[in-house]
Interface confidence: medium
């Protein structure tokens, strides 16, 4: 009679976490008499998974009744699989011996892979805003996937980025894995509407990869440009001075008018106009009663944007060119801001 062979027909078995794995094993003969044991791994450090003769294996059930005399099916089911169960499982036939059973023949092994999808990537940007031409870092994290192989890409507005570093942890064998990547992005003035995308592709996903996004509007600060101009005289002794605050982001902005260094009025940008690139424009104006001034007036528009140090622009108002009106002591009217778009 031919010598007994232990057949493990499946080279590999894939199971989703939480499910049951079936590991198939059959023997080609009833002889020699002796039990079957299942192990994970080979060699001296192998782990006993199931012993037909003795022991308690709560997660393991046999596919057929091993107590039947003519049984040659030694397949098992392992319940509630986790990624920690991944490995190669061997079905081993023992020959009845005295005092101990002797290992007789092993199957070729079945590799159990546990699949787990990566979590949706989470992209986070810097804690503080940065201005154009500066380089900022974005991080992307995804967790809980298995097997370890994974691909991560970065995009800015659909264009792939190359300046990034990625780590998959842990380095060795593990229950499941995490990926962490840091990308460097150079900001431009046009980035208010830009998006940074982290894309993760894994063998458990079908079709399109998972994506995480960050809006650069949360990261960028575009400082304003200021222009102070003198408008034509509205009345014989009044001059209209405007301060155009252009191309700023975010909207948080406070403007102060100074006459010869003294605060005349402070206001907060409320009704702004939005440019196509997502930045804002705003205009404030001041009516100056020139008859109240003997000398030339230095008008300063001072802007504090998004909590940053103030920037300012000045305009020298020539008083000598205007006839003085007797008895007038009002230097400026609190006119509020002009809400029209100046473009």
């Amino acid at each position: 009679e031919e010598e007994l062979q232990v057949i493990q027909p499946d080279k590999s078995v894939l199971v989703a976490a939480g499910e049951t794995a079936t590991l198939r094993c059959t023997a080609t003969s009833l002889i020699p008499v002796g039990p079957i044991q299942w192990f994970r791994g080979a060699g001296p450090g192998r782990e006993l998974i199931y012993n037909q003769k003795e022991g308690h294996f709560p997660r393991v059930t046999t596919v057929s009744d091993l107590t039947k005399r003519n049984n040659m099916d030694f397949s098992i089911r392992i319940g509630n699989i986790t990624p920690a169960d991944a490995g190669t499982y061997y079905c081993v036939k023992f020959r009845k011996g005295s005092p101990d059973d002797v290992e007789f023949k092993s199957g070729a092994g079945t590799e159990l892979s546990v699949r787990a999808k990566p979590s949706a990537p989470v992209v986070s940007g810097p804690a503080a805003r940065a201005t154009p031409q500066h380089t900022v870092s974005f991080t992307c994290e995804s967790h809980g996937f298995s097997p370890r192989d994974i691909t991560l890409k970065w995009f800015k507005n659909g264009n792939e980025l190359s300046d990034f570093q990625t780590n998959v942890d842990p380095v060795g064998e593990s229950v499941s894995y995490s990926i962490h990547s840091t990308a460097k992005v150079v900001l431009t003035r046009e980035d208010v509407h830009s998006q940074v995308i982290c894309e993760v592709a894994h063998v458990t996903l079908q079709g399109d990869p998972l994506r995480g996004t960050a809006n650069l509007s949360e990261t960028i600060r575009v400082p304003p440009t200021l222009e102070v101009t003198q408008q034509p005289v509205r009345a014989e002794n009044q001059v209209n001075v405007t301060c155009q605050v252009r191309k700023f982001y975010p909207q948080r902005l406070q403007l102060t008018w100074l006459e010869n260094g003294n605060v005349s009025r402070t206001e907060t940008a409320s009704t702004v106009t939005e440019n196509k690139d997502g930045t804002y424009n705003w205009m404030s104006w001041l009516l100056v009663n020139v008859s109240a001034h003997r000398d030339d007036v230095k008008l300063t528009c001072q802007v504090e944007h998004d909590g940053q140090p103030a920037v300012s622009k000045s305009h020298d108002l020539k008083v000598s060119a205007h006839p003085k009106e007797q008895g007038s002591n009002t230097a400026a009217e609190n006119t509020g801001s002009n809400e029209r778009n100046i473009y």
Epitope: V15, A16, T20, A21, R115, T151, V203, Q206, G207
Partner: antibody, heavy 120, light 112 residues
Amino acid sequence: QVKLQESGAELVRPGSSVKLSCKASGYTFTSYWMHWVKQRPIQGLEWIGNIDPSDSDTHYNQKFKDKATLTVDNSSSTAYMQLSSLTSEDSAVYYCASYGNYGENAMDYWGQGTSVTVSS
Amino acid sequence: DILMTQTPLSLPVSLGDQASISCRSSQSIVHSYGNTYLEWYLQKPGQSPKLLIYKVSNRFSGVPDRFSGSGSGTDFTLKISRVEAEDLGVYYCFQGSHVPFTFGSGTKLEIK
């Protein structure tokens, strides 16, 4: 061995719905995506969508988004496709197919097909 | 959606001849994971389709070595080195890289 057993032929009225089934055996049902494919008489194959039984994650061909609903019952290792608001355009053979070879993402195994005829 | 264009629509051959079917995708079908999920299926009359080739050039188990797949990017080819009677039917290419997955229109291999 792997087998995908689809439900029998259906003759249905226009405007009604039908639920097709695909019972899987011989492999771990939750480990592989299940696909559904349409074939009209003397025509080619159209991919309808797929479902991951482990978490009911689905992808649809937009063309079938309002037509087909994919579900699974893991306890019976069965995948279902419900087709709604049926018209003569839905008369076709519908196949289920499974990715049986992990990591290769190919439809290794196919059901025998279910013929759906929409007629008044 | 990615359009898969197969040529020819019909391919008359003599038994023992070589047959070649072309499949062109309207855009690259390299998946983000790096693989190209281009498959070839054969559907014989009255039967379900059967997988022949996966990932461009890998023969599925049990498929004779007279079948071979090649190509990259957007251009792919299925070759049958010596056509046998059991090879007759309709061949479909399929991309499984980008949702929605799409089939080619099919090529009917028939006897001259």
